[in-house]
C-alpha cells in the first residue's frame, strides 16, 4: 500500500503519501483555529506508471494507455485514497467548540 | 459539475474532463477484444485552484496552500469522478462471452 | 498482408490417407484458432473441424461426419495447421479451406486444396 | 447445434436490382446487442470472402452496397444495386456456440 508506512521509509519517486506540514495561521491565514497550530496534513505526488495502485478499470486502462502512448498528456493521477479527520478547537465569542474535520489528513495514495 | 456536458461545450482550462477515444487492439494491444473496436474512455486534467469542485476537506486545504504557497509541489490533482461500465464481446476458445467491465468512462472529474 | 497457403491434396482411394497443411503468415498465428472448412462438389460449406491457441488448451472440433478420422493439429514454431484424413471416403471429395477465426468470422481464406476420393 | 436456413435457396436478378437474402437460425444468435452472425460471398474457384461480419459491421475492402442486419434468430444482407461481379452464392454463418455452422446457400444468377 502507498501509505506513510511505506512512503515515508522509502526513496520512492512514483506514486507516494509525502509529507506536509501546515501552518494554520501561516499557511492559510485561518486565525481562528487556535489548537493545534498547524499539522501534518500530507500530499500525493509522483508518476502513476502502468498497475500502479490503479484505482480503477479506467485508470488501468490509461496507464496502459500512457505506457504505449508516451506522447500523450492522457494519465493516471496520484491522489488520496485514505484520509483521516482532525479535531481542532476555536472559539465562538468567548466559547470553546471542539470539532472534528473530516479529510484532513492523507494516509495513503492510489492512482486515479 | 465539471462533466461531459460542461466540458465538451467550453473552452475550459480548469480541471474538466477531455475526449480521449482508445482503441482496444492500437493503443493497448488488446486483441482479445473483439466488440467494440474502441471506445470514448475520457481522461480529466487541468489546474485544480482554490474550491474548484473539492473532493475533500483535504484538496480544500491543499487548494488554499497552494494558493497562498504558489511556489509549493502540493496542489490537489483533477482525476475522475463518475464512472460508467462498458459492455465488451470477446472470446474464450470459440465460446462467445459479454461481459461488462466496470468504471471505464469518465463522465465527471473533480479535485482531490 | 495475411496469407494461407493450403498443400497436400490430391487423389487417394477410399480408405486411404491424407495429410493437409496449411501454412500461415501475416498474422499472430500463435494467437487465433484455425480452421478447416470444406465444400463438396454441388454442396454447401461445412466447419470439419477447428482448433483454437494454446491460451485455450489447442481444444479441438471435429464434425459428425469426420469424427474419430481426421486429426487436426497445429505446430505454432512453423505457423502451420495440418488435417490428417484416414479411412476416407467418397463424401469427403471436397474443396479443403484453411482459414482463421480472430473473433467469430472467418475474416482470411486459403486458396483451397482439392481433395479427391476415388476408385 | 445451431442450424441456419437460408431463404431462398437460389434467385435471378439483373444488374441495378435490390437483392435480400435471409437467413433464420433455429436458436437466438444474439448475446447482449452482439449480433453473431455473419455472411461470406462464395465464387466458383475462388475462396469464400467475408462480407459482413456481427450482423451489420461491413468488412475491410467490400463495397458499400452490401449491407446486412437482423438480431435474434432473424438476419438479413442485402445488395442495393446488383453488379456483374455481384453473382455469387452467399453465405450466412453464427459464432453464437461451438459448432459454428454455416447456413445452406443462395446462389445469385443473372436473369
Known amino acids: 500500500a502507498l501509505d506513510t508506512n511505506y512512503c515515508f521509509r522509502n526513496l520512492e519517486e512514483n506514486c507516494c503519501v509525502r509529507p506536509l506540514y501546515i501552518d494554520f495561521r501561516q499557511d492559510l491565514g485561518w486565525k481562528w483555529v487556535h489548537e493545534p497550530k498547524g499539522y501534518y496534513a500530507n500530499f500525493c505526488s509522483g508518476p502513476c506508471p502502468y498497475l500502479r495502485s490503479a484505482d480503477t478499470t479506467h485508470s488501468t486502462v490509461l496507464g496502459l494507455y500512457n505506457t504505449l502512448n508516451p506522447e500523450a498528456s492522457a494519465s493516471p493521477c496520484c491522489v488520496p485514497q485514505d484520509l483521516e479527520p482532525l479535531t481542532i478547537l476555536y472559539y465562538v465569542g468567548r466559547t470553546p467548540k471542539v470539532e472534528q474535520l473530516s479529510n484532513m489528513v492523507v494516509k495513503s495514495c492510489k492512482c486515479s | 459539475a465539471l462533466d461531459t456536458n460542461y466540458c465538451f461545450r467550453n473552452l475550459e482550462e480548469n480541471c474538466c474532463v477531455r475526449p480521449l477515444y482508445i482503441d482496444f487492439r492500437q493503443d493497448l494491444g488488446w486483441k482479445w477484444v473483439h466488440e467494440p473496436k474502441g471506445y470514448y474512455a475520457n481522461f480529466c486534467s487541468g489546474p485544480c485552484p482554490y474550491l474548484r469542485s473539492a473532493d475533500t476537506t483535504h484538496s480544500t486545504v491543499l487548494g488554499l496552500y497552494n494558493t497562498l504557497n504558489p511556489e509549493a509541489s502540493a496542489s490537489p490533482c483533477c482525476v475522475p469522478q463518475d464512472l460508467e461500465p462498458l459492455t465488451i464481446l470477446y472470446y474464450v476458445g470459440r465460446t462467445p462471452k459479454v461481459e461488462q467491465l466496470s468504471n471505464m468512462v469518465v463522465k465527471s472529474c473533480k479535485c482531490s | 498482408e495475411v496469407q494461407l497457403l493450403e498443400s497436400g491434396g490430391g487423389l487417394v482411394q477410399p480408405g486411404g490417407s491424407l495429410r493437409l497443411s496449411c501454412a500461415a503468415s501475416?498474422?499472430?498465428?500463435?494467437?487465433?484458432?484455425m480452421s478447416w472448412v470444406r465444400q463438396a462438389p454441388g454442396k454447401g460449406l461445412e466447419l470439419v473441424s477447428d482448433i483454437v491457441s494454446k491460451t485455450y488448451n489447442y481444444t479441438t472440433y471435429y464434425s459428425d461426419s469426420v469424427k474419430d478420422r481426421f486429426t487436426i493439429s497445429r505446430d505454432d514454431s512453423k505457423s502451420t495447421v495440418y488435417l490428417q484424413m484416414n479411412s476416407l471416403r467418397a463424401e469427403d471429395t471436397a474443396v479443403y479451406y484453411c482459414?482463421?477465426?480472430?473473433?467469430?468470422?472467418?475474416?482470411?481464406w486459403g486458396q483451397g486444396t482439392l481433395v479427391t476420393v476415388s476408385s | 447445434d445451431i442450424q441456419l436456413t437460408q431463404s431462398p435457396s437460389s434467385l435471378s436478378a439483373s444488374v441495378g436490382d435490390r437483392v435480400t437474402i435471409t437467413c433464420r437460425a433455429s436458436q437466438s444468435v444474439s448475446i447482449s446487442r452482439f449480433n453473431l452472425m455473419h455472411w461470406y460471398q462464395h465464387k466458383p474457384g475462388k475462396q469464400p470472402k467475408l462480407l459482413i461480419y456481427r450482423a451489420s459491421n461491413l468488412a475491410s475492402g467490400i463495397p458499400s452496397r452490401f449491407s446486412g442486419s437482423g438480431s435474434g434468430t432473424d438476419f438479413t444482407l442485402t445488395i442495393s444495386s446488383l453488379q456483374p461481379e455481384d453473382f455469387a452464392t452467399y453465405y450466412c454463418?453464427?459464432?453464437?456456440?461451438?459448432?459454428?455452422?454455416f447456413g445452406g446457400g443462395t446462389k445469385v444468377e443473372i436473369k
Open positions: 482459414t482463421v477465426a480472430p473473433g467469430g468470422s472467418f475474416d482470411y
Open positions: 501475416g498474422f499472430d498465428f500463435n494467437s487465433y484458432g
Open positions: 454463418q453464427h459464432s453464437r456456440e461451438s459448432p459454428w455452422t
